[in-house]
Amino acid sequence: SVRVEQVVKPPQNKTESENTSDKPKRKKKGGKNGKNRRNRKKKNPCNAEFQNFCIHGECKYIEHLEAVTCKCQQEYFGERCGEKSMK
């Protein structure tokens, strides 16, 4: 079995609008192109500052929540899959 451990509990407030992100985008002449901005891929924190975050598991980024989680290997649990269950 595989456990998914949330790094931190996501906020209950889910009123995010899709056209906001912390990704820089090049300014386009003629105003915002909402479609292009919305569809542009953001960098994955699992390849960056969270690269070595999950000890016995795989880093997962839930983009619409902007939440990083660890998908733990069997028998491991905890925020970073660092704890082993005694079974």
Partner: antibody, heavy 116, light 109 residues
Framework: EVQLQQSGAELVRSGASVKLSCTAS????????IHWVKQRPEQGLEWIGC????????EYAPNFQGRATMTADTSSNTAYLQLSSLTSEDTAVYYC?????????WGQGTLVTVSA | QAVVTQESALTTSPGETVTLTCRSS?????????ANWVQEKPDHLFTGLIG???NRVPGVPARFSGSLIGDKAALTITGAQTEDEAIYFC?????????FGGGTKLTVL
């Protein structure tokens, strides 16, 4: 060790330009966004802009649009900030920092002094 | 441009829980604002703490947590320690630029 090393202090004349550098070690800047902020003496932080070094995409704060230019050289793992038409108001410490969804890694800052 | 407001100063005691908040002049702070929290210690030493409202930067102690409380972003330090004495800045994302708050000077007595 993950680190952002910034260039040394600059003393520049009013009206001139300055180019600051920010070199990453321990990580590849292509995987991050690199931001620049300004901190004037005894004041808060003012965001200047950020760059995606992978493709050169940039975003600037309204106050710095047209006067700041951010670039990046992925071969040397270095990001640059050029500021033009400097005034005494630009005397400040400038920081670079990197992250994706966080502001994880910070440089030590570069003091820029603008003289009349 | 939006204005981001923080408490100018707070004082707490070691072991206590303290919450710092971050308000937006444009209305309620939501997850769209991707609240970030940064710590500044003497000699201009900056450390990222929280990003995307809730994600703790790897290596940051678990006593630091980010959330939304009412219409504001919040940084909670559960069991403050003397080394947490610092200035804390929040930053909010507004569609195409970040705005920093003025910072909260936290004293741990």
């Amino acid at each position: 060790e993950v680190q952002l090393q910034q260039s040394g202090a600059e003393l520049v004349r009013s009206g001139a330009s300055v180019k600051l550098s920010c070199t990453a070690s321990g990580f590849n800047i292509k995987d991050y966004y690199i931001h620049w902020v300004k901190q004037r003496p005894e004041q808060g932080l003012e965001w200047i802009g950020c760059i995606d070094p992978e493709n050169g995409d940039t975003e600037y704060a309204p106050n710095f649009q047209g006067r700041a230019t951010m670039t990046a050289d992925t071969s040397s793992n270095t990001a640059y900030l050029q500021l033009s038409s400097l005034t005494s108001e630009d005397t400040a410490v400038y920081y670079c920092y990197g992250g994706t969804i966080t502001f994880a890694y910070w440089g030590q800052g570069t003091l820029v002094t603008v003289s009349a | 441009q939006a204005v981001v407001t923080q408490e100018s100063a707070l004082t707490t005691s070691p072991g206590e829980t303290v919450t710092l908040t971050c308000r937006s002049s444009t209305g309620a702070v939501t997850t769209s604002n991707s609240a970030n929290w940064v710590q500044e210690k003497p000699d201009h030493l900056f450390t990222g703490l929280i990003g995307g409202t809730i994600n703790r930067v790897p290596g940051v102690p678990a006593r630091f947590s980010g959330s939304l409380i009412g219409d504001k972003a919040a940084l909670t330090i559960t069991g403050a320690q003397t080394e947490d004495e610092a200035i804390y800045f929040c930053a909010l994302w507004y569609s195409n630029h970040w705005v920093f708050g003025g910072g909260t000077k936290l004293t741990v007595l």
